[in-house]
Structures are given as structure tokens and as C-alpha cells.
Interface confidence: low
Amino acid sequence: CRTSECCFQDPPYSDADSGSASGPRDLSCYRISSAGYECSWQYEGPTAGVSHFLRCCLSSGRCCYFATGSATRLQFSDQAGVSVLHTVTLWVESWARNRTEKSPEVTLQLYKSVKYKPPLGDIKVSKLAGQLRMEWETPDNQVGAEVQFRHRTPSSSWKLGDCGPQDDDTESCLCPLEMNVAQEFQLRRRRLGSQGSSWSKWSSPVCVPPENPPQPQVRFSVEQLGRDGRRRLTLKEQPTQLELPEGCQGPAPGVEVTYQLQLHMLSCPCKAKATRTLPLEKMPYLSGAAYNVAVISSNRFGPGPNQTWHIPADTHTEPVALNISVGTNGTTMYWPARAQSTTYCIEWQPVGQEGSLATCNLTAPQDPDPAGMATYSWSRESGAMGQEKCYHITIFASAHPKKLTLWSTVLSTYHFGGNASAAGTPHHVSVKNHSLDSVSVDWAPSLLSTCPGVLKEYVVRCRDEDSNQVSEHPVQPTETQVTLSDLRAGVAYTVQVRADTAWLRGAWSQPQRFSIKVQVSD
């Protein structure tokens, strides 16, 4: 028999079936050109000394074989004696050491057995009722297919699955979706209704993220507030990267997890926009306000869990930057202005009530006045900061108030509201003898001392009632005691104490009379 023809004789070996699980498998035969055909198969087991024979039985009942030696692929023409227009049954017999191993047979019409293409181009992936749905355009002239998929995770080997028959211009497949690990999928096709026809090659990998994106494990640090009233938020620890299956380790689209930063500015609630979302790579500058920061992970299926941090307000205060003048019409604040057309947000809140919502006012965009100052005024009737207590005031500025990341802190300071002059008057002034010519004067701390930076100093005034001579003694704001020296015995004195702020003289306390007794010697 010629090697190019199917030999209509008995094969040159005895048919002693080994019954082994190994041997030839996955036989596929198809047309490769108008008159050319190909059959190929796999062989499992030791290959030394193995000879392969492609067996063929025609519909007429006659049978023949091709001897391929050690090769597991054979090409032949429509002139090789095998009917290509009628149904034929083909199988492989592999002969070695006087034993024969057989493949499962395939029954087909060779002329109609076209090598199908795998899904090509864009494979769309979506989630449907907790499962994975893949969809693609059917390759040209190949409508009517059986489709299989295989999938693996980073830690598992390939598992095979069936997509069922397809008969449309678009094909689709439902596959299992893993909750917490990435998967690699591949698809293959073969002609519908011809079990013997061959499978296409596997498609390019389709990389699918887990249903739940991973919890973003990141850490932040916040730099000190700069002179411009802004501080940089920096990422100390990058999110952990998802473990990927082998075929998804290059630049595989579809499996990426994106991380976004969601900023929520808690201070100044009266501004236009309190929340902003930006990519994690784009670390923003923040004002000295308090913020909540969330890192949100998401993949092609949507958002996953997030991790939230609280960034406390920068409590550094500048006691001198704010000037407050109280007049009959109301109160005006002055502070060093920023650029032209700047919007300011003035926020205040009683000290000790930090949990409650702060009062907040947004100015219209304003230019600096001739002295380079910005101002904010309110009437007495408004009741703003009218109570005699300590208020924490923060002023923020922005040329673009709708852009959350462009706010900066102008100043943060404290102010004593209401009639600070009267409210700050020291009480419980007491005088104790100290020596023959000195006394110790003590008083209870002024209410102003509860307000950091507000109390500039105490002033103690001593008046000699005989001569009407007055002396004044400045005392540090942290002290509540002073010693008055060089006093004369037997003379009546009055002492008073007042508490002063940077912009306001306090009211004197009630006069306290005292005298040093004259010592009588024996």
C-alpha cells in the first residue's frame, strides 16, 4: 500500500486489546483546505516503540488504515480512498509490545467537519445572579457550535466545563464565579451536532477578578500643616496585589483592582461640596480641617469593601493672626487676607463641645482691603459668639470653593465671646501677710484662662489710701498670685485684679482693703 492512501488490508499486527487507561485519546479530524484533511490525537503513556494506525470504516462496510509510525498527526487528500462526502468512523489503534490500545471512535462526514475557531476578539464579561456570563461574537461562517470552557485559580489546575450548544450570531457561557480569588478562563468551540469533529484551539485567556475585591490594606500619614495652610496626605503602605493565575500575570485586562480615595471634609459643613473621590495614586493636599478618608476597592464587577480613617483637625493655633473688634453695631473679625476673590469659611464652636456641630459661615468671594486684611462682621442680634464662653475659631480659604482639595487653613485660634471684659474679671481675690512689709495676693483664675492664647496677662493694682499713690503689677497669664513688697505698716491699701486680652482691657475686680499691722516691741 502507498503511504498516501488508506490501505484496505488487515493491519500488520494482532488485535490484542490491553484494556489500559492510557493510550490514544482526543482524536479529531477536519477539513483543512478544499481537498485536504487532517486527523490528530494525543497519546498518553510511554512513547518508546509505539506505532500508530489510523483506522477507518466506510459506510459501505469496508475498512482501511493509515500507518503513521510514531507521528500523532496525519494529512491526506480526498483521493486517499476515504469517502469525504459520506459518514465514516475513525479511531486510532496504537500498537506496542504486542498490545493494542484504542481511542474512542469518532463518526463524521469529513467534508462538513470544519476546524472551528475559538472565540476571537473581545469577550465581554458580566455578573449574572452570582455567576459569570461571558459573551462574544460568533466567528464568521461558524454559527452552530458546542462550547467548552476551562478555568483555574492561582492555586488550582485546569477544570473543564460545558457551555452547551450555541446557535446564534453571538455566543455566551455561564461559568462559576469565585468570591475571593482571581480566575483565568479559556474557551473552545466545535461544530454543533458532530461529536467527532475537532475542538478549536483554546481562546486567549480571559482574566476574571474575584466577586469581592480585596479589602484595601493601606496606611496613611499626614504631614505638618505648611505655611500655606495645607498638609500633604501620603500613602505609607500600598494595597496588596491580588494573586493571579499563570495566564493572567502579564498586563491582563479585566482582573485589575482599582483603588479610589474618598475624602469627606468634616469641618466647615456650610461649604458647597463636602466629598470628593480621586484615584489613590493622586494623593491630595488637605487643609487643617478634620476629614474622614475611605479607600474603596473596585473591579469590573463594581465596588468592594472599604477601609475608613479619621484624620483629626490640626490643632496648632496662632493666637495673634485674628483681630476682633466689638462695637455698638456688632462684631468684626480681621485677618491677613489671601489672594483676590477668595472665599472664606469661618467656623466656630464652644470649647468642650467638639462633638456637636460647629457654626459655620461662608463669605462671598472677597478681595483684600487696603490694609491687606479680610473681614467678616455680624450684628449683636444674630447672637453669634454672644455667650460668655470660650470659642474655637477656624478660618479656611479657597479660590475654588467647590473643589474640596483646594481649601487651606488661614488660622485657628480661640476667642472669648460675649462681654469678655466683665466675664473675665478675676474673683475670690484674697490678701495674706507675707512679711513685715509685704503681702501675697491670690485670685481665682479668670474665665479667660480657659481659652488658650486669649488671656494676655493679669494686672494687679495696689492703691495707698493715705497718699492715693497707685502701683500696677503685670502678672503672667499662667500665674494667679503676686507678692506686693515695700508696704508700710499701719497704712490702708486697696488691691484689685483685672484680666487683659490682646485687644481688650479687662474690668477691675471688687477693691479688697488690707493693712499691715504695726509691730509693737516689748
Epitope: 456570563r133 477544570k159 460545558d162 457551555c163 452547551g164 450548544p165 455566551s172 457561557c173 462559576p176
Partner: nanobody
Framework: QVQLVESGGGAVQAGGSLRLSCAAS????????MAWFRQAPGIEREFVAS???????YYADSVKDRFTISRDNAENTVYLQMNSLKPEDTAVYRC???????????????WGQGTQVTVSS
């Protein structure tokens, strides 16, 4: 010929537990999905849970965190562990096998006769 036989149904008080079993015979393919459905009188058949050949599981929202589906491949058996049962879980529970997955999910070609579960308050 594929055959599915369910067992383990019965009557139980609310808050109690039951374990249903479904034994399959005659399956030639290893790649199949096994699922539980339920049907109460006058109500449409409802999907309860499914388990794929690779072990992936899916649950109806109404039973999530209460029911657990599992399988024993060697025995070709699927189980449904039902905890914290409620009166609204009362139904006939049927086991099904899908050997093909079409565009609309597993096609359940084979069905068991069903087992009655009654939960009283």
C-alpha cells in the same frame, strides 16, 4: 438512566435544623451542577441553592447564612443543611441535576420526586 432520590425531610419547630440528602445514580458525566429547589402550595418553584462540580456554591438571598449545600463526589450525593428554620421555609424540596450549562444557567434535565419540610411556629 439517571435517578435522584431525596431524603431527610420532616416536621420541625421554628429555629430548628434539618439535613436533606439527594443521591444520584446513572450519571456518566463528571461535570454537572446539583441544586435544590422548593415549592410551597400555590407558589412558583423557587431556587434554593446549587453546587458546581468545582465546589462553588450559590444561595437564594432568603436562605443565605442559614442553609449550606455540600456534596460527596465519591458517593454522587448532595446535601442541604438547613439551620434557623422559619415557617416560610415550609415546602416540598426537590433536588435537580444539570449536565449542561446554557446561556441562562444550568439546564436541569433530571429531577427527584421531592421531600416535604414543614416548619411550625
Amino acid at each position: 438512566q439517571v435517578q435522584l432520590v431525596e431524603s431527610g425531610g420532616g416536621a420541625v419547630q421554628a429555629g430548628g435544623s434539618l439535613r436533606l440528602s439527594c443521591a444520584a445514580s446513572g450519571l456518566t458525566s463528571r461535570h454537572y451542577v446539583m441544586a435544590w429547589f422548593r415549592q410551597a402550595p400555590g407558589i412558583e418553584r423557587e431556587f434554593v441553592a446549587s453546587i458546581w462540580w468545582g465546589g462553588s456554591t450559590y444561595y437564594a438571598d432568603s436562605v443565605k447564612d442559614r442553609f449550606t449545600i455540600s456534596r460527596d463526589n465519591a458517593e454522587n450525593t448532595v446535601y442541604l443543611q438547613m439551620n434557623s428554620l422559619k415557617p416560610e421555609d415550609t415546602a416540598v424540596y426537590r433536588c435537580a441535576v444539570g449536565t449542561k450549562i446554557g446561556t441562562m444557567g444550568p439546564r436541569y434535565d433530571y429531577w427527584g420526586q421531592g421531600t416535604q419540610v414543614t416548619v411550625s411556629s
